[in-house]
Interface confidence: medium
Amino acid sequence: AGLKLMGAPVKLTVSQGQPVKLNCSVEGMEEPDIQWVKDGAVVQNLDQLYIPVSEQHWIGFLSLKSVERSDAGRYWCQVEDGGETEISQPVWLTLVPRGSSAHHHHHHHHSAWSHPQFEK
């Protein structure tokens, strides 16, 4: 599986209290089970959404409603492929205090889309 994190830089800096959406694109697999991981622990998100771009291309989403200090860390996505776990390149999420101007490089794979999630 060609696994890559789409539309996110290696380092992502956001202001405290702001929302963040991460996209993970998986190519070369049919119906992958995309899981998000933060600092080694799977991120529970009951409304985990996947968009099929094509039969062999899927995008998974992780959305944080309101970023706080505890959300800072290293994020990646992973899929199981033939009994082996493949992981994406990580993204480091760092915070600046509320009201500061964050150098926000985050770019959505489809910036116009709105994907319902539970995290603010």
Partner: antibody, heavy 125, light 108 residues
Framework: EVQLVQSGADVKKPGASLTISCQAS????????ISWVRQKPGKGLEWMGQ????????NYGPSFQGHVTISADRSTATAYLQWRSLEASDTAMYYC??????????????????WGPGTLVTVSS | SYELTQPPSVSVSPGQTARITCSGD??????AYWYQQKSGQAPVLVIY???KRASGIPERFSGSSSGTMATLTISGAQVEDEADYYC???????????FGGGTKLTVL
């Protein structure tokens, strides 16, 4: 057209086992999660749990953990809710629910939630 | 276990603004969804992600969230808006979801 077809109403005695079903059509079954919601007569909605069919990953509400089992059969695009031993307090309407996206003309997919019509389960001696 | 708290009932006259609240400790971090259920029918999604109106829902329905409180507002309530309304969200760690107890809206 997206459809969730639920199995018909059922009457059981306490202690009996039961499985109700929710068959999906009109979309790729494994795209999104399916959840189950209980509504006792004249009462509110209760989230029971859900399954991600592609991985058969499940989550349960604290009140339902250990009392029901949620499963899915990808070959028939069907989700199931199962009891090993029913109690009178399980008498309720049970709904299955799933989200889906639909793009109508533009590039922005609209978010929908589809609810099945419900299955009425009556447990009585 | 995690709970979402709603008032049992809200009454307004036709044309007035109805506000239904939902409080929960995790709402600063978790989005609220709102459902409308009319008698004998399955619920219908009204608002998702705090404030986004679901497809086919009239513009008089709006949602907002601040701190531990989410609010569903119906501006200019109509008789046909009489229904039970439920908020819905997740507990803080995302392990399970919950519905609020429901609010019966009466439009007299």
């Amino acid at each position: 057209e997206v459809q969730l077809v639920q199995s018909g109403a059922d009457v059981k005695k306490p202690g009996a086992s039961l499985t109700i079903s929710c068959q999906a059509s009109g979309y790729t079954f494994t795209d999104y999660w399916i959840s189950w919601v209980r509504q006792k007569p004249g009462k509110g909605l209760e989230w029971m749990g859900q399954i991600v069919p592609r991985a058969s990953r499940t989550n349960y509400g604290p009140s339902f953990q250990g009392h029901v089992t949620i499963s899915a059969d990808r070959s028939t695009a069907t989700a199931y809710l199962q009891w090993r031993s029913l109690e009178a307090s399980d008498t309720a309407m049970y709904y299955c629910v799933r989200p889906y996206f639909q793009t109508s003309g533009g590039t922005i997919p609209e978010y929908y939630q589809h609810w099945g019509p419900g299955t009425l389960v009556t447990v009585s001696s | 276990s995690y709970e979402l708290t709603q008032p049992p009932s809200v009454s307004v006259s036709p044309g007035q603004t109805a506000r239904i609240t939902c409080s929960g400790d995790a709402l600063p971090k978790k989005y609220a969804y709102w459902y409308q259920q009319k008698s004998g029918q399955a619920p219908v999604l009204v608002i998702y992600e705090d404030e986004k109106r679901a497809s086919g829902i009239p513009e008089r329905f709006s949602g907002s969230s601040s701190g531990t409180m989410a609010t569903l507002t119906i501006s200019g309530a109509q008789v046909e808006d009489e229904a039970d309304y439920y908020c819905y969200s997740q507990e803080r760690n995302g392990n399970y979801a919950v519905f609020g107890g429901g609010t019966k809206l009466t439009v007299l």
